[in-house]
Interface confidence: medium
Amino acid sequence: LQDLCSNCPAGTFCDNNRSQICSPCPPNSFSSAGGQRTCDICRQCKGVFKTRKECSSTSNAECDCISGYHCLGAECSMCEQDCKQGQELTKKGCKDCCFGTFNDQKRGICRPWTNCSLDGKSVLVNGTKERDVVCGPSPADLSPGASSATPPAPAREPGHSPQ
């Protein structure tokens, strides 16, 4: 018997109960490719998810996260709570970054300040919970022959800035 299912376009399914007749997908389902024997149930964007793109007969719904949450995983499979800048999400909720670390986003973890001295540079702007340090010129660049409008600030190691 010739397989008629290959003739069924996206948006339909091949109804084997009826001599392989193509039928449109039922409401709230879709088939994104031709020749499908079933339609897939549309994703529902509920709870912390909100609809970014409605389901159609040929494509699944796409979800975003409601305000205060952000997407994680492929196709926004999870929503994770936002934290403030200067915080990270732990099992107990949002916690301030430890001294010497920062987070400039509403998501992710606190990361250590850059160690300027590893690159032979000095700290130009101190780090905070929300911002990394800004490294300045190396001490060698600040020799007496170098022109500078203001005398250089003494180099500080990360970790000595007031919080």
Epitope: R18, I21, P26
Partner: antibody, heavy 120, light 107 residues
């Protein structure tokens, strides 16, 4: 509610091509199959074929060599062309909606029909 | 092609009568059968789908039954507006085919 309206010439000469349009109003043409059915005077109903909104078609084998169906989703319209007509093609031509998945293609909405006479 | 036959080809009945029309398929079609009513000069109207499903807006005096090859349309109490021709149609396989019709007229 969804309504269908057939349009096209009522008289076609033998050996020429019969062309009919069906306009869908009050709803979207999308996600349905749409059929053409004809009925010679005083006789029964004959299914000609159907088309999906993507252009996928199924034709009655008895007419397949002469039938072409097309769809224009922007105009909410689908059409029938039947080539090399003879007097045997004289009939009332109906367009109808295949009643989607739960109706298993029973025709749930019909146009009022248009009479086509093949005569020189 | 699946051949559909109907009996009787015509029936004379009075208002209030119970009318039964049968439809037979040349091969099994499960429940993939519809019934239509056609008044002269009008388009057919869907009454029953998948053998026994009553189409929305159709009076409950119409009912359908059967599966496989033998099907029945019953009008429990004939009304003046029911005098018409009734067709069965199979949607089990291509090409979709109709029965020849049963004419219900006034006795």
């Amino acid at each position: 509610q969804v309504q269908l309206q057939e349009s096209g010439p009522g008289l076609v000469k033998p050996s020429e091509t019969l062309s009919l349009n069906c306009t869908v109003s009050g709803g979207s043409i999308s996600n349905y199959y749409w059929s053409w059915i004809r009925q010679p005077a005083g006789k029964g109903l004959e299914w000609i074929g159907r088309i999906y909104t993507s252009g996928n078609t199924n034709y009655n084998p008895s007419l397949k060599s002469r039938v072409t169906m097309s769809v224009d989703t922007s105009k909410n319209q689908f059409s029938l062309k039947l080539t090399s007509v003879t007097a045997a093609d004289t009939a009332v031509y109906y367009c109808a909606r295949d009643g989607n998945w739960n109706y298993a293609d029973a025709f749930d909405i019909w146009g009022q029909g248009t009479m086509v006479t093949v005569s020189s | 092609d699946i051949q559909m036959t109907q009996s009787p080809s015509s029936v004379s009945a009075s208002v209030g009568d119970r009318v039964t029309i049968t439809c037979r398929a040349s091969q099994g079609i499960s429940s993939w059968l519809a019934w239509f009513q056609q008044i002269p000069g009008k388009a057919p109207k869907l009454l029953i789908y998948t053998a026994s499903g009553l189409q929305s807006g159709v009076p409950s005096r119409f009912s359908g039954s059967g599966s496989g090859t033998d099907f029945t349309l019953t009008i429990s109490s004939l009304q003046p507006e029911d005098f018409a021709t009734y067709y069965c149609q199979q949607t089990n396989s291509f090409p979709f085919t109709f029965g020849p019709g049963t004419k219900v007229d006034i006795k």
